[in-house]
C-alpha cells in the first residue's frame, strides 16, 4: 500500500469575522494507526487547535464522522472566527507511540485570513476653538480591521481634502490593524455649518464606506463686529444709543456699557437672531439722560465673546446748548451732537 499522504487542498481561505471557517484535510490511507491533530503555526511554538485523540475544543467540530473507520476526511470547522484566529493551519497525522505519539506526516498548510470590519471612524478636532483664517488639525481613527489594505479620504462639505497624513499600524503582519489620519483645515467665517468627514473604505464593507464626522461649529469661533449708533432723540433730554453686535459664534457673549469709562450696565446676550451662515446678531441699547451731563459723554460698548479678551467700540455724545423746540413746553436744554464712532 502506498504511504499515507495528508492533503490540504486549500492553500488559503478568507473568512469574515464572526463566521465559521472550514479547514479541509484528507488522508490517503488508514495506516499507520494514530490520531490526526490540527495546529496553527509550525515548529516548537505551534498551537494545538484540535486533537482527535483527546481534549476539549469547544469551537471546533469535525466535518465528517470520525467514528467511522473508513473515514479519511479530517476537515474541521472553527466557529465564531475572530482576527486572532488568523494564521496557517496544519493537518498532521501522528503514529501511535510512546512516550508521545510520533509525527508521521503533515499537510502543506492552509492560511486563514480573517476579514474584519473597521470600527466606525472617530473624528476629533482641536481642544480649543480657532478663528477664521487659522489652520486646524482633525484626526480620524478606526481600528480592528483586516486585511491591512484600506482607503481613507477627507471631505469638507463634500469637497475632498488633500492636506492630510495617514498611517496604518502595525507596519508588519498582525491579526488586525488600525488607521490614524490627520487632516489640516483652513477655517473661514462661513464654516459654522460646515462638516469635516472622514471616510473609510475596506473590502469588508462591500462598497459602503464608513464615515465619521466633526461639526466645525465645535471648532470655530467667529468674533463679532461692533457698531455703535446714535438714534434720533426720543425725548427732550434723552438719547438712545445702540450697539450692534454682528456675525459672532458661538452664542456666549457679555456686553458692558461704559459712560466715560464707568460701567453703566452689563448684560448677557439673549434673544439672538441667527444668520443663514449660523452666526448670530444681537443689539443692545442705552438711553442716556443728557441733562445729567455738563460735558461731552464717551459711550463705550465693550463685548467679551466666548471668554476671549474684550473688544470695544466707542461713541462720543457732544453736549451743547440748543434752542427750545417749537411747540415744546420744556425748558431749554443742551443740544445733542454725535461724533463718528471711534
Amino acid at each position: 500500500e502506498e504511504e499515507l499522504q495528508v492533503i490540504q487542498p486549500d492553500k488559503s481561505i478568507s473568512v469574515a469575522a464572526g463566521e465559521s471557517a472550514t479547514l479541509h484535510c484528507t488522508v490517503t490511507s488508514l495506516i499507520p494507526v494514530g490520531p490526526i491533530q490540527w495546529f496553527r503555526g509550525a515548529g516548537p511554538g505551534r498551537e494545538l487547535i484540535y486533537n482527535q485523540k483527546e481534549g476539549h475544543f469547544p469551537r471546533v467540530t469535525t466535518v465528517s464522522d470520525l467514528t467511522k473507520r473508513n473515514n479519511m476526511d479530517f476537515s474541521i470547522r472553527i466557529s465564531n472566527i475572530t482576527p486572532a484566529d488568523a494564521g496557517t493551519y496544519y493537518c498532521v497525522k501522528f503514529r501511535k507511540g510512546s512516550p508521545d505519539d510520533v509525527e508521521f506526516k503533515s499537510g502543506a498548510g492552509t492560511e486563514l485570513s480573517v476579514r474584519a470590519k473597521p470600527s466606525a471612524p472617530v473624528v476629533s478636532g482641536p481642544a480649543a476653538r480657532a478663528t477664521p483664517q487659522h489652520t486646524v488639525s482633525f484626526t480620524c481613527e478606526s481600528h480592528g480591521f483586516s486585511p491591512r489594505d484600506i482607503t481613507l479620504k477627507w471631505f469638507k462639505n463634500g469637497n475632498e481634502l488633500s492636506d492630510f497624513q495617514t498611517n496604518v499600524d502595525p507596519a508588519g503582519d498582525s491579526v488586525s490593524y488600525s488607521i490614524h489620519s490627520t487632516a489640516k483645515v483652513v477655517l473661514t467665517r462661513e464654516d459654522v455649518h460646515s462638516q469635516v468627514i472622514c471616510e473609510v473604505a475596506h473590502v469588508t464593507l462591500q462598497g459602503d464606506p464608513l464615515r465619521g464626522t466633526a461639526n466645525l461649529s465645535e471648532t470655530i469661533r467667529v468674533p463679532p463686529t461692533l457698531e455703535v449708533t446714535q438714534q434720533p432723540v426720543r425725548a427732550e433730554n434723552q438719547v438712545n444709543v445702540t450697539c450692534q453686535v454682528r456675525k459672532f459664534y458661538p452664542q456666549r457673549l457679555q456686553l458692558t456699557w461704559l459712560e466715560n469709562g464707568n460701567v453703566s450696565r452689563t448684560e448677557t446676550a439673549s434673544t439672538l437672531t441667527e444668520n443663514k451662515d449660523g452666526t448670530y446678531n444681537w443689539m443692545s441699547w442705552l438711553l442716556v439722560n443728557v441733562s445729567a451731563h455738563r460735558d461731552d459723554v464717551k459711550l463705550t460698548c465693550q463685548v467679551e465673546h466666548d471668554g476671549q479678551p474684550a473688544v470695544s467700540k466707542s461713541h462720543d455724545l457732544k453736549v451743547s446748548a440748543h434752542p427750545k423746540e417749537q411747540g415744546s413746553n420744556t425748558a431749554p436744554g443742551p443740544a445733542l451732537a454725535s461724533a463718528a464712532p471711534l
Epitope: 488508514l30 495506516i31 485523540k53 473507520r69 508521545d100
Partner: antibody, heavy 118, light 107 residues
Framework: EVQLVESGGGLVQPGGSLRLSCAAS????????MHWVRQAPGKGLEWVSA???????YYTGSVKGRFTISRENAKNSLYLQMNSLRAADTAVYYC????????????WGQGTMVTVSS | DIQMTQSPSSLSASVGDRVTITCRAS??????AAWFQQKPGKAPKSLIY???SLHSGVPSKFSGSGSGTDFTLTISSLQPEDFATYYC?????????FGQGTKLEIK
C-alpha cells in the same frame, strides 16, 4: 447492528490443527485492524494475533510460526489457522475489533472454546 | 514486552462504595491504556480507551485517568451489576498486553 460471531472451536489433540472463523456484520471488516484474544480457563486475557488494514500481521511470541491470521473480504470474515497445537493453547478465543483510529478494542465476539487434549 | 501490573488482585466492596483500581506499565505507554469488564462466562466488555475516554454506552460512573506509566479506573458508586473482574491493557505497541485482572467482590 455491529456484531462478531466466532466458530470453529472444539477438541483437538496436541500437534493437531484447527481453523477459527469470525463472521463480522454491521461493518466492513477490512477497514479495521482485527485481533484474536484468548483466555485460558480461570486465567486472564492474553492477546494472540492481529491483522492490519494493509494485511500486515502480528503475533505474540508463543504462537509465532504456528498460528496464521487472515481475512476474506468477500465473506467479511476473519480467520485464525492454528497448527501444532499445545495443551497451553487451551482457551476461549475471542475475535475483537480494533478501534477507529487508535486500535483500541471496542467490539468483542462471544468467544469459541478450543481444547487441546489427548 | 510491556508488562502491565494491576493492583489489587482482588477487592471487596459494598454497594454505593467508590473504588479505584490501579495499573502500572513497565515503561511509558503514552495514554494508550484501556480498561475492560468481564463477568463469569461472558466476553469482556470495553469500558475505557486512551486512559480516560468512555466507550459508547458506558455509564459515567466509570472514569479513567493517567498517562505514562500509571493509570486508574474509578467506579464512583458501586451497583450490584458492577461486581466483576476488571482488566487493564496497553495497546501502544505489539504485543498488546493485559494486566492480570482485579476481581471486585461484594463485601
Amino acid at each position: 447492528e455491529v456484531q462478531l460471531v466466532e466458530s470453529g472451536g472444539g477438541l483437538v489433540q496436541p500437534g493437531g490443527s484447527l481453523r477459527l472463523s469470525c463472521a463480522a456484520s454491521g461493518f466492513t471488516l477490512s477497514s479495521y485492524d482485527m485481533h484474536w484474544v484468548r483466555q485460558a480457563p480461570g486465567k486472564g486475557l492474553e492477546w494472540v494475533s492481529a491483522i492490519g488494514t494493509a494485511g500486515d500481521t502480528y503475533y505474540t511470541g508463543s504462537v509465532k510460526g504456528r498460528f496464521t491470521i487472515s481475512r476474506e473480504n468477500a465473506k467479511n470474515s476473519l480467520y485464525l489457522q492454528m497448527n501444532s497445537l499445545r495443551a497451553a493453547d487451551t482457551a476461549v478465543y475471542y475475535c475483537v475489533r480494533g478501534g477507529v483510529w487508535d486500535d483500541a478494542f471496542d467490539i468483542w465476539g462471544q468467544g469459541t472454546m478450543v481444547t487441546v487434549s489427548s | 514486552d510491556i508488562q502491565m501490573t494491576q493492583s489489587p488482585s482482588s477487592l471487596s466492596a459494598s454497594v454505593g462504595d467508590r473504588v479505584t483500581i490501579t495499573c502500572r506499565a513497565s515503561q511509558g505507554i503514552n495514554n494508550y491504556a484501556a480498561w475492560f469488564q468481564q463477568k463469569p462466562g461472558k466476553a469482556p466488555k470495553s469500558l475505557i480507551y486512551t486512559a480516560s475516554s468512555l466507550h459508547s454506552g458506558v455509564p459515567s460512573k466509570f472514569s479513567g485517568s493517567g498517562s505514562g506509566t500509571d493509570f486508574t479506573l474509578t467506579i464512583s458508586s458501586l451497583q450490584p451489576e458492577d461486581f466483576a473482574t476488571y482488566y487493564c491493557q496497553q495497546y501502544v505497541s505489539y504485543p498488546y498486553t493485559f494486566g492480570q485482572g482485579t476481581k471486585l467482590e461484594i463485601k
